[in-house]
């Protein structure tokens, strides 16, 4: 008996071939001997089966001795043994129809779980293997689960169902909803304008939800809300904003915030959350602000940084085009009685200067 695997919703073509290359009488029946379709001369006739409106054949092939049964919009319950009667012979074809669906919406938040459920005919014992867009393989039986979805899991998942050494392939498009970056850091000199951007890693037709930015300033004992906003069809509208600092928010995506001035009291870490309509859970992006200040008070030249810096960062004070006068892995450095000239305060790591502030020291007479 020949085995054919089909996909729910698809069309399948079961073949039946006569030895004579001409149009002769044929019938297709199911395992209950109920006629599905056949021919009377050059006319297609249909029987009383449940497939009536979804069954068809290809008349153009009859003259060649081919009498296929075409079943459209396959259902799991179409799984059966189909018998083609032609020339006093019976050809049996076992059709097994499978369906693979995501348990919920195919748009899932980063960190959520994806469950794929296989619908299969009674008596079958298929195995399933799915490959994610980033090449991760998962296998199982009736259900497959992937926990902690990552941004790289967005795209087409290819799943192969294996039964009776035959296979059928399903493709499921999954969209992982997330920000492009989980975390970012901005380095600014005191007084400079600060731009925070929160680009999303996905595009959808309509995007509706609400969000909030909580800020934990390094100098503050607790965090506070800086801004709340709504998102309607990709349009951003501010609901509430703190008066200190005077934040401004862009009206279009990507989400964009402007802090008019970087000040030491604002240095710290923020957490932007975005709740999307009809989704449980929230998207998160951490943002960090490091602020540098260089000052001269009487005979003391000081450079300070505030904010979440790595303990490996080096803070240096140097006279332009000269060796550093002082370099420390600390958040403040100073030089007493500095020479006149242009001094540079540098915040650097192993690979680059991250932040630089210049201060002019005038000669003392």
């Amino acid at each position: 008996k020949k085995v054919v695997l089909g996909k729910k919703g698809d069309t399948v073509e079961l073949t039946c071939t006569a030895s004579q290359k001409k149009s002769i009488q044929f019938h297709w029946k199911n395992s209950n001997q109920i006629k599905i379709l056949g021919n009377q001369g050059s006319f297609l006739t249909k029987g009383p089966s449940k497939l009536n409106d979804r069954a068809d054949s290809r008349r153009s092939l009859w003259d060649q001795g081919n009498f296929p049964l075409i079943i459209k919009n396959l259902k799991i319950e179409d799984s059966d043994t189909y018998i083609c009667e032609v020339e006093d012979q019976k050809e049996e074809v076992q059709l097994l129809v499978f369906g693979l669906t995501a348990n919920s919406d195919t748009h899932l938040l980063q960190g959520q779980s994806l469950t794929l459920t296989l619908e299969s005919p009674p008596g079958s014992s298929p195995s399933v293997q799915c490959r994610s867009p980033r090449g991760k393989n998962i296998q199982g039986g009736k259900t497959l689960s992937v926990s902690q979805l990552e941004l790289q899991d967005s795209g087409t998942w290819t799943c192969t169902v294996l039964q009776n050494q035959k296979k059928v392939e399903f493709k499921i498009d999954i969209v992982v909803l997330a920000f492009q970056k989980a975390s970012s850091i901005v380095y600014k000199k005191e007084g400079e304008q600060v731009e925070f951007s929160f680009p999303l890693a996905f595009t959808v037709e309509k995007l509706t939800g609400s969000g909030e930015l909580w800020w934990q300033a390094e100098r503050a004992s607790s965090s506070k809300s800086w801004i709340t906003f709504d998102l309607k069809n990709k349009e951003v509208s501010v609901k509430w904003v703190t008066q200190d600092p005077k934040l401004q928010m862009g009206k279009k995506l990507p989400l964009h915030l402007t802090l008019p001035q970087a000040l030491p009291q604002y240095a710290g870490s923020g957490n932007l959350t975005l709740a999307l309509e009809a989704k449980t859970g929230k998207l998160h992006q951490e943002v960090n602000l490091v602020v540098m200040r260089a000052t001269q008070l009487q005979k003391n030249l000081t450079c300070e940084v505030w904010g979440p810096t790595s303990p490996k960062l080096m803070l240096s004070l140097k006279l332009e085009n000269k060796e550093a006068k002082v370099s420390k892995r600390e958040k403040a450095v100073w030089v007493l009685n500095p020479e006149a000239g242009m001094w540079q305060c540098l915040l650097s790591d192993s690979g680059q200067v991250l932040l630089e502030s210049n201060i002019k020291v005038l000669p003392t007479w």
Epitope: I185, Y187, T309, S310, K312, L313, M314, A324, S350, G351
Partner: antibody
Amino acid sequence: QVQLVESGGGVVQPGRSLRLSCAASGFTFSSYGMHWVRQAPGKGLEWVAIIWYDGNNKYYADSVKGRFTISRDNSKNTLYLQMNSLRAEDTAVYYCTREVALEGYYYYMDVWGKGTTVTVSS
Amino acid sequence: AIQMTQSPSSLSASVGDRVTITCRASQGIRNGLGWYQLKPGKAPKLLIYAASSLQSGVPSSFSGSGSGTDFTLTISSLQPEDFATYYCLQDYNYPYTFGQGTKLEIK
């Protein structure tokens, strides 16, 4: 392509000196911190030293502090490790590796040489 | 110096198994931790940086998690080429320190 090639290893007596070199190619050498990491026979990896992109800052493992000096010549795209007062426990494969620094926040060693073997024995 | 304690020191597993290796720092290191794979006669290979970021070109069967003092490397389904020694490295502060290593062997 990005490549690091170590040289200068060999057999040396305890108390003597040796200088290792690491030739870098395929990337802007002067924009990266560079490390030396070693593995003694039958032991695990041990971090040895780092030098910053401009050569101004250097840090060492306690086990080599005062005996080893890391340096670089950005014009020659070369990293060095001067090893003085060598001991039997310095016997190891020495790797040079590049450090990527992202936003002053994330760090990782993404490119490694194949290593050069140093044997300290009398 | 920050001490890194890695466990187990060795581990026997079969192809297809899920394996977990842990690393504990003697003090908080935020997410300043990387995982490296070492095979005999080869250069070490970066797998995970910043505790959970997968290095480009590394199979997605590898994943990292944790923050602060406790970190985990998970291999979801072992492949024959995954049998090697794995090391954690704290790169939060100088001097950098490696864990003692975990040798992953075929059962």
